[in-house]
Interface confidence: low
C-alpha cells in the first residue's frame, strides 16, 4: 500500500482544474491512500473540500467519505482519459447538499454509488441520467445507496423532498438497471406514484425508517424480480386489498415490515386474512396492533373477524366535543 | 401422495446436450415455484435454478447460458435443458417443489428422486 | 454472493450426543434460511425453514437459531435415525449465486 499526505499542511485539498495534468497510472493524490494491488483509494476523513483532479487510473474503489465537499458539480469524475475503471463510489458522510445534473457523468464502470448521510438540499434530477433527453443513455448503476439524506428543514426547498428525489431516479430512465437501492431513514411521507414503474430489474428496495404512512398509490406490480422489500419502522396503519394482492403475486418477494403502528380495526380484516396466508412476509408472527389501545400489542396472526370492529360513526347531533 | 419424477437423465458426450423432465403427480405445479438441484457422486448439493411461479427464472452463475429451466404447465412437467455438457456436470439431478412459504431463492419441500447424468467420452 | 459456508465438515458422536452445526452467509440473508437431512441414496428432507421453524413432521430435537449471516442447527440428543449428512441453504437470494448450499455436514458414529 501506498499513501500521499500533504507536505505543507493539513489544509483541504484544494484541486486546480486549470492546471490538471493527465493523471500518471500509479500517482497518489495528497491526503489519499492508495493500493493499486486492490485498485482502491481512499480519501477518508481528510475535510476535503474538492474531488482530487489527479486520482490514479487504477482507481475501481474509491472512498471518499467524511469530508466536506459541499457541491458535486458536473463532471466531478470526468478526466482525460477517463476513470474508466471506477466500480464503486462511496461519498457518504461528505456534508454534500448539493449534487448537480451530470455529476457522474464519464464513469462508464460505475456500477455501486453510495450518497448516504450527506443533507442533500438539492438533487438535481439529473444526477444520474446526465442529461435532460427523455430518454437518456442508460446508466451502469447496479446498486444506488441514499440512506439519511433529507436535509434538516431550515435547509429544505420549497418542493417536497420525496420529489425531488423521484424525480431524480426516474429522469431519462437511466435507472432501468438498478438492482438495489437503498432510501432508508429520510422522512418520507409518501412514495410518489411513478417512480417503481421506472425501476423494473430491482431486486432489494429498502424503505425502513421513515414515515411512510400508506402505500396505497404506490404500484408494486412491475417488480417482478424483487427479492426484499424493506418497510420496517415505517408509519404504516393497514396495508389495502390493492397491495397485498400486488405483493402476492410477485414471485420471489420477501417483504419486511416490523414496528409499524398497524391500526387493528375493522379495515385491517383483508390483511389479517392475507397473512394468515401469506409466505411473502418475513417475522409475521412479530407484528402487533399499536391502536386502538383495547388491541395494543394483540398479535396480528391471532386475531379473528370478531376483534376487528370499527366503533359507529355517531350521527352529529349525538357526537360531544 | 405428491410425487416428482425426473426422467431423460444417461450418458452424453462432452459438448452434447440433454433434456431433463420432471413430472408431478398429486400436485398442481402451475401453484409452485420448482428448481432443479444436483449432486456429483460423493459430493455436497449444488443449487441449479428455480422457475417462480410467474416464470421469472434465475440460475446459479456458472449455469446461466448452458441451462434452461422451462415448465408446461398443461402436461404437469418442468424440465432443464442443458446444452455444452462437461465432465463436470456428471451428478444426479433433483427436480424439488419450491415450498409456499419461503424466500426469494427458496426452500425446496418436496423433491423426486433424482436421475444421473454421466458426461464422458 | 450469498455463499454458505458450513462447519464443520464432519462430526462423530453418539446417541443422546448434542450436536451443533453452523452455517455463514458471506451477506445478511435475513433469516431466510434452510436445514437439510440427507441419507445415503435418498433425497434430502426438508427440516427447518426461516432459520427456525421446523417443517411439518420433524421432531422437536431439532432447533434452528440465528439472524444476519451467523446461523446454527442443534440436535439436542442424537438419535439413531439422525446419523445423516446436513445441509444449510440460504433461500434469500437467486442473483449472483454460485451455490445456494453449504457444503454439508456428516453426522457420523462414534
Known amino acids: 500500500t501506498s499513501s500521499a499526505s500533504s507536505s505543507s499542511s493539513s489544509a483541504p485539498f484544494l484541486a486546480s482544474a486549470a492546471s490538471a495534468q493527465p493523471p500518471l497510472p500509479d500517482q497518489c493524490p495528497a491526503l489519499c491512500e492508495c493500493s493499486e494491488a486492490a485498485r482502491t483509494v481512499k480519501c477518508v476523513n481528510r475535510n476535503l473540500t474538492e474531488v482530487p483532479t489527479d486520482l490514479p487510473l487504477y482507481v475501481r474503489n474509491l472512498f471518499l467519505t467524511g469530508n466536506q465537499l459541499a457541491v458535486l458539480p458536473a463532471g466531478a469524475f470526468a478526466r482525460r482519459p477517463p476513470l474508466a475503471e471506477l466500480a464503486a463510489l462511496n461519498l457518504s458522510g461528505s456534508r454534500l447538499d448539493e449534487v448537480r445534473g451530470g455529476a457522474f457523468e464519464h464513469l462508464p464502470s460505475l456500477r455501486q454509488l453510495d450518497l448516504s448521510h450527506n443533507p442533500l438540499a438539492y438533487l438535481s434530477p439529473f444526477a444520474f441520467s446526465g442529461s435532460n433527453a427523455s430518454i437518456s443513455a442508460p446508466s451502469p448503476l447496479v446498486e444506488l445507496i441514499l440512506n439519511h439524506i433529507v436535509p434538516p428543514d431550515d435547509k429544505r426547498q420549497n418542493r417536497s423532498f420525496e420529489g425531488m428525489v423521484a424525480a431524480a431516479l426516474v429522469a431519462g430512465r437511466a435507472l432501468q438497471g438498478l438492482h438495489l437501492l437503498e432510501l432508508a431513514s429520510n422522512h418520507f411521507l409518501y412514495l410518489p406514484r411513478d417512480v417503481l414503474a421506472q425501476l423494473p430489474s430491482l431486486r432489494y428496495l429498502d424503505l425502513s425508517n421513515n414515515s411512510l404512512v400508506s402505500l396505497t398509490y404506490v404500484s408494486f406490480r412491475n417488480l417482478t424480480h424483487l427479492e426484499s422489500l424493506h418497510l420496517e419502522d415505517n408509519a404504516l396503519k393497514v396495508l389495502h386489498n390493492g397491495t397485498l394482492a400486488e405483493l402476492q403475486g410477485l414471485p420471489h418477494v420477501r417483504v419486511f415490515l416490523d414496528n409499524n403502528p398497524w391500526v387493528c380495526d375493522c379495515h385491517m380484516a383483508d390483511m389479517v386474512t392475507w397473512l394468515k396466508q401469506t409466505g411473502v412476509v418475513q417475522g409475521k408472527d412479530r407484528l402487533t396492533c399499536a391502536f386502538p389501545e383495547k388491541m395494543r400489542n394483540r398479535v396480528l396472526l391471532e386475531l379473528n373477524s370478531a376483534d376487528l370492529d370499527c366503533d359507529p360513526i355517531l350521527p352529529p347531533s349525538l357526537q360531544t366535543s | 401422495e405428491v410425487q416428482l419424477e425426473e426422467s431423460g437423465g444417461g450418458l452424453v458426450k462432452p459438448g452434447g446436450s440433454l433434456r431433463l423432465s420432471c413430472a408431478a403427480s398429486?400436485?398442481?405445479?402451475?401453484?409452485?415455484?420448482m428448481g432443479w438441484v444436483r449432486q456429483a457422486c460423493g459430493k455436497g448439493l449444488e443449487w441449479v435454478s428455480i422457475?417462480?411461479?410467474?416464470?421469472?427464472?434465475y440460475y446459479a452463475t456458472w449455469a446461466k447460458g448452458r441451462f434452461t429451466i422451462s415448465r408446461d404447465n398443461s402436461k404437469n412437467t418442468l424440465y432443464l435443458q442443458m446444452n455444452s455438457l462437461r465432465a463436470e456436470d456428471t451428478a444426479v439431478y433433483y427436480c424439488?417443489?419450491?415450498?409456499?412459504?419461503?424466500?426469494?431463492?427458496?426452500?425446496?419441500?418436496?423433491w423426486g428422486r433424482g436421475t444421473l447424468v454421466t458426461v464422458s467420452s | 454472493g450469498y455463499d454458505m459456508t458450513q462447519s464443520p465438515s464432519s462430526v462423530s458422536a453418539s446417541v443422546g450426543d448434542r450436536v451443533t452445526i453452523t452455517c455463514q452467509a458471506s451477506?445478511?440473508?435475513?433469516?431466510?434460511l434452510a436445514w437439510y437431512q440427507q441419507k445415503p441414496g435418498k433425497a434430502p428432507k426438508l427440516l427447518i425453514y426461516?432459520?427456525?421453524d421446523l417443517a411439518s413432521g420433524v421432531p422437536s430435537r431439532f432447533k434452528g437459531s440465528g439472524s444476519g449471516t451467523e446461523y446454527t442447527l442443534t440436535i439436542s440428543s442424537l438419535q439413531p435415525e439422525d446419523f445423516a449428512t446436513y445441509y444449510c441453504?440460504?433461500?434469500?437470494?437467486?442473483?449472483?449465486?454460485?451455490?445456494?448450499f453449504g457444503g454439508g455436514t456428516k453426522v457420523e458414529i462414534k
Open positions: 451477506e445478511n440473508i435475513y433469516s431466510t
Open positions: 426461516d432459520a427456525f
Open positions: 424439488a417443489r419450491r415450498a409456499t412459504y419461503s424466500g426469494a431463492l427458496g426452500y425446496f419441500d418436496i
Open positions: 441453504q440460504q433461500g434469500y437470494s437467486g442473483t449472483n449465486v454460485d451455490n445456494a
Open positions: 422457475i417462480s411461479r410467474n416464470s421469472v427464472t
Open positions: 398429486g400436485i398442481d405445479l402451475s401453484s409452485y415455484g
